[in-house]
Interface confidence: medium
């Protein structure tokens, strides 16, 4: 499996030139792409991540409250080569 | 249609300054990276400087670091470029560039800046 | 010198087939970033060709294909025409330069 790759402040995603792709490690079956966003009194901070994953494909929509910070994650997982953009 | 018109070129003495503005219609500014590649009299392109689409993540080629200043106004859909302490050497056709899917998919038609004394 | 190498020049007959190399180096189509192809007609600005080494924008006709393979890319044109004629130059992301890099381009020559 091939899938995109990258790490960047979620504000603005990743740079449309900046994209990689990735070969995936054996037995890994999904594409990934994760924003995380946690919220401090100081603001929020984000970020963007895509590359190789685990588990099954699909969306997955998470809100924590890690005692006062408050944690955003936007999971989402596919099967085909390249299918994370 | 997307279209990208640029503008400010023109001549100017070493060690001077020039504003390029680059009119973005067609798209939703806001949400596009843009960039700026030049082109020297008969040579290849160069990529000078890019920015987000929110302007908080800027980049610069080394060549023109220090000198040159990108930044955008989404509320006038406009990109521009700062050129400051100018050199005969960044004499080029200056176009502002669309980053779509991966890559520059829209070029303006480029405006001339010739440093000469 | 471009960080991205290319020949300076090719030529075909119409019909032909061309291919145009685009090597690089680890810091950029061998880090895995993907590679990009603009076209540039005489005196006009360039236009997006190929794009994520191999993907051809809507209204790109299929005779233009790309690949990567390692640290080189290249970019094949089969059926030449006249109208191909103009400068191809190829690009990618690079990690030392923190910026994407375009290769010196190739002046394609339709001949006869």
């Known amino acids: 499996l091939e899938c995109y790759s990258c790490v960047q402040k979620a504000d603005d995603g990743c740079s449309p030139n900046k994209m990689k792709t990735v070969k995936c490690a054996p037995g890994v079956d999904v594409c990934t792409e994760a924003v995380g966003a946690v919220e401090t009194i100081h603001g929020q901070f984000s970020l963007a991540v895509r590359g190789c994953g685990s588990g099954l494909p699909g969306k997955n929509d998470r809100g924590l409250d890690l005692h006062g910070l408050l944690a955003f994650i936007q999971l989402q997982q596919c099967a085909q080569d390249r299918c994370n953009a | 249609e997307v279209q990208l018109l640029e503008s400010g070129g023109g001549l100017v003495q070493p060690g001077g300054s020039l504003r390029l503005s680059c009119a973005a219609s067609g798209f939703t500014f806001s949400n596009a990276w843009m960039s700026w590649v030049r082109q020297a009299p008969g040579k290849g392109l160069e990529w000078v400087s890019y920015?987000?689409?929110?302007?908080?993540?800027?980049y610069y080629a080394d060549s023109v670091k220090g000198r040159f200043t990108i930044s955008r106004d989404n509320s006038k859909n406009t990109l521009y470029l700062q050129m400051n302490s100018l050199r005969a050497e960044d004499t080029a056709v200056y176009y502002c560039?669309?980053?779509?899917?991966?890559?520059?998919?829209?070029w303006g038609q480029g405006t001339l800046v010739t440093v000469t004394s | 010198q471009s960080v991205l190498t290319q020949p300076p020049s090719a030529s075909g007959t119409p019909g032909q087939r061309v291919t145009i190399s685009c090597t690089g180096s680890?810091?950029?189509?061998?880090?895995?970033?993907?590679v990009h192809w603009y076209q540039q007609l005489p005196g006009t600005a360039p236009k997006l060709l190929i794009y994520?080494?191999?993907k051809r924008p809507s209204g790109v006709p299929d005779r233009f294909s790309g690949s990567k393979s390692g640290t080189s890319a290249s970019l094949a044109i089969s059926g030449l025409r006249s109208e191909d004629e103009a400068d191809y130059y190829c690009?990618?992301?690079?990690?030392?330069?923190?910026?994407?890099?375009f290769g010196g381009g190739t002046k394609l020559t339709v001949l006869g």
């Open positions: 680890s810091s950029n189509i061998g880090a895995g970033y993907v």
């Open positions: 690009a990618a992301w690079d990690d030392r330069l923190n910026g994407p890099v």
């Open positions: 994520d080494n191999n």
């Open positions: 560039a669309r980053e779509g899917l991966w890559a520059f998919d829209y």
């Open positions: 920015i987000s689409s929110s302007g908080s993540t800027i």
